[in-house]
Interface confidence: medium
C-alpha cells in the first residue's frame, strides 16, 4: 500500500514495523536454561526498533503477526557430543510471560549437528516476553554470525 506524505515522515516505530535482531550475551546461571540476549549499534549488527530487552529477554511492544527467527550454533560440540554428553540438546522459543499466554512457539533438537535454525510466523501481543531455552549441557557460541535471534512485525 502507498503511504501518505504525513505517514512517510513518521518514524518506522509509529507505523508498526517493529523489528529486532539480537546477539547472544550469555547463558543463564545453573538450572536456568534461558539464553540472554543483547542488541544495539555499539555491539555490531544487532538492533532493537520497537521491541525491548527485559533482563536479556525480548519483550514485544506492539500487537501483530511477527516473523520469529533464530539460529544457534553450539560452541562446544561435535558430531558425537550432541548424543554422547549427558543429555540431548534442545532449543525452544516460547512466550514465557505473561503466564496466561505462556506457549512454546518453536522446538528444535540438535541431533548430530552443531547448528540449528528455524523461523515461523506467529501472532504476538504487547507485553509478550519471548524466552529461548537451551536444555542439555552443551554451550552456544557467541559468534555473531553463528548465533542470533530476531523478530519482525509483518502485519496487524
Amino acid at each position: 500500500q502507498r503511504l501518505s506524505r504525513a505517514q512517510q515522515q513518521l518514524p518506522l516505530e509509529s507505523l508498526g514495523w517493529d523489528i529486532a535482531e539480537l546477539q547472544l550475551n550469555h547463558t543463564g546461571p545453573q538450572q536456568d536454561p534461558r539464553l540472554y540476549w543483547q542488541g544495539g549499534p555499539a555491539l555490531g549488527r544487532s538492533f532493537l526498533r520497537g521491541p525491548e530487552l527485559d533482563k536479556g529477554q525480548l519483550r514485544i511492544r506492539r500487537d501483530g503477526i511477527y516473523m520469529v527467527h533464530i539460529q544457534v550454533t553450539l560452541a562446544i560440540c561435535s558430531s558425537t557430543s550432541t548424543s554422547r554428553h549427558h543429555h540431548p540438546t534442545t532449543l525452544a522459543v516460547g512466550i514465557c510471560s505473561p503466564a496466561s499466554r505462556s506457549i512454546s512457539l518453536l522446538r528444535l533438537s540438535f541431533h548430530q549437528g552443531c547448528t540449528i535454525a528455524s523461523q515461523r510466523l506467529t501472532p504476538l501481543a504487547r507485553g509478550d516476553t519471548l524466552c529461548t531455552n537451551l536444555t542439555g549441557t552443551l554451550l552456544p557460541s557467541r559468534n555473531t554470525d553463528e548465533t542470533f535471534f530476531g523478530v519482525q512485525w509483518v502485519r496487524p
Epitope: T27, I76, E146
Partner: antibody
Framework: EVQLLESGGGMVQPGGSLRLSCAAS????????MSWVRQAPGKCLEWVSA????????FYAESVEGRFTISRDNSKNTLYLQMNSLRAEDTAVYYC?????????????WGQGTLVTVSS | EIVLTQSPGTLSLSPGERATLSCRAS???????LAWYQQKPGQAPRLLIY???SRATGIPDRFSGSGSGTDFTLTISRLEPEDFAVYYC?????????FGCGTKLEIK
C-alpha cells in the same frame, strides 16, 4: 591484568588423590568458562576438563572421566580439579586456562602450572 | 576425536628468515575453530592466533595464520630471536579439544 595461579600439585602414589586449585584475578571470574590442560614431561598438551562460567556444565576427556571432577567457587574466584584413582600416566604439569569468553573454547590466558607426580 | 598432525617436528632457521609451520587435521574443523600457541621452556603456552587467522591481543603482525578445513598454516614473516620456541595448534570445534604435538623452532 589476568592472573591464574595453580597450587596443590605434588607426589602421590598410584590410586591416591589430589585436589588442584587455581586462584584467578584480573577478570570477572564467573563470566568465563575455565579448563584444565596437562602436559606430561616432554609430551604433547592434553585437554583434561572444562567448566562453564556458572559451573552448571562440565566436560571431560575420556582418559579422566569418572576419576576427575572439575568444579569452581565463583565467590572465591577459584577453580578446582579433584583427581582420584591416580595413575602413573596422570603425571604431568597441570595448567588452568581461561576461555576467551563464557562459551568459547580457545584459551586466552594460562597459569604457570603445577606438577603432579604419580609414582610408587 | 580430531587428531592434529604438525610438521615439521623441528624447524631450524636463522633470525630474519621466514618460518612456515603446518597443522593438518584428521577431519574438517568447523568454522576454522583452530588456534596457535607459543610455548617457551618452563613457561605456559601463549595464545597467538584464534579462528585460524585472527591475531590475539598484543601479538606482533609478523605472526599470521591461514587455512581452513583440514590444512592450516602459521607463518612468521621475519624471525626475531624471541620467536624460537615450540608452537602448538589446537582445534576447539569438537569435543574433546585436541592439540598437535608441536613444532620446535630452533636457531640454526
Amino acid at each position: 591484568e589476568v592472573q591464574l595461579l595453580e597450587s596443590g600439585g605434588g607426589m602421590v602414589q598410584p590410586g591416591g588423590s589430589l585436589r588442584l586449585s587455581c586462584a584467578a584475578s584480573g577478570f570477572t571470574f564467573s563470566s568465563y568458562a575455565m579448563s584444565w590442560v596437562r602436559q606430561a614431561p616432554g609430551k604433547c598438551l592434553e585437554w583434561v576438563s572444562a567448566i562453564s562460567g556458572s559451573g552448571g556444565r562440565t566436560f571431560y576427556a575420556e582418559s579422566v572421566e569418572g576419576r576427575f571432577t572439575i568444579s569452581r567457587d565463583n565467590s572465591k574466584n577459584t577453580l578446582y580439579l579433584q583427581m582420584n584413582s591416580l595413575r602413573a600416566e596422570d603425571t604431568a604439569v597441570y595448567y588452568c586456562a581461561k576461555h576467551d569468553y563464557s562459551n568459547y573454547p580457545y584459551f586466552d590466558y594460562w597459569g604457570q602450572g603445577t606438577l603432579v607426580t604419580v609414582s610408587s | 576425536e580430531i587428531v592434529l598432525t604438525q610438521s615439521p617436528g623441528t624447524l631450524s632457521l636463522s633470525p630474519g628468515e621466514r618460518a612456515t609451520l603446518s597443522c593438518r587435521a584428521s577431519q574438517s574443523i568447523r568454522s576454522s575453530y583452530l588456534a596457535w600457541y607459543q610455548q617457551k621452556p618452563g613457561q605456559a603456552p601463549r595464545l597467538l592466533i584464534y579462528g585460524a587467522s585472527s591475531r590475539a591481543t598484543g601479538i606482533p603482525d609478523r605472526f599470521s595464520g591461514s587455512g581452513s578445513g583440514t590444512d592450516f598454516t602459521l607463518t612468521i614473516s621475519r624471525l626475531e630471536p624471541e620467536d624460537f620456541a615450540v608452537y602448538y595448534c589446537q582445534q576447539y570445534g569438537d569435543l574433546p579439544f585436541t592439540f598437535g604435538c608441536g613444532t620446535k623452532l630452533e636457531i640454526k
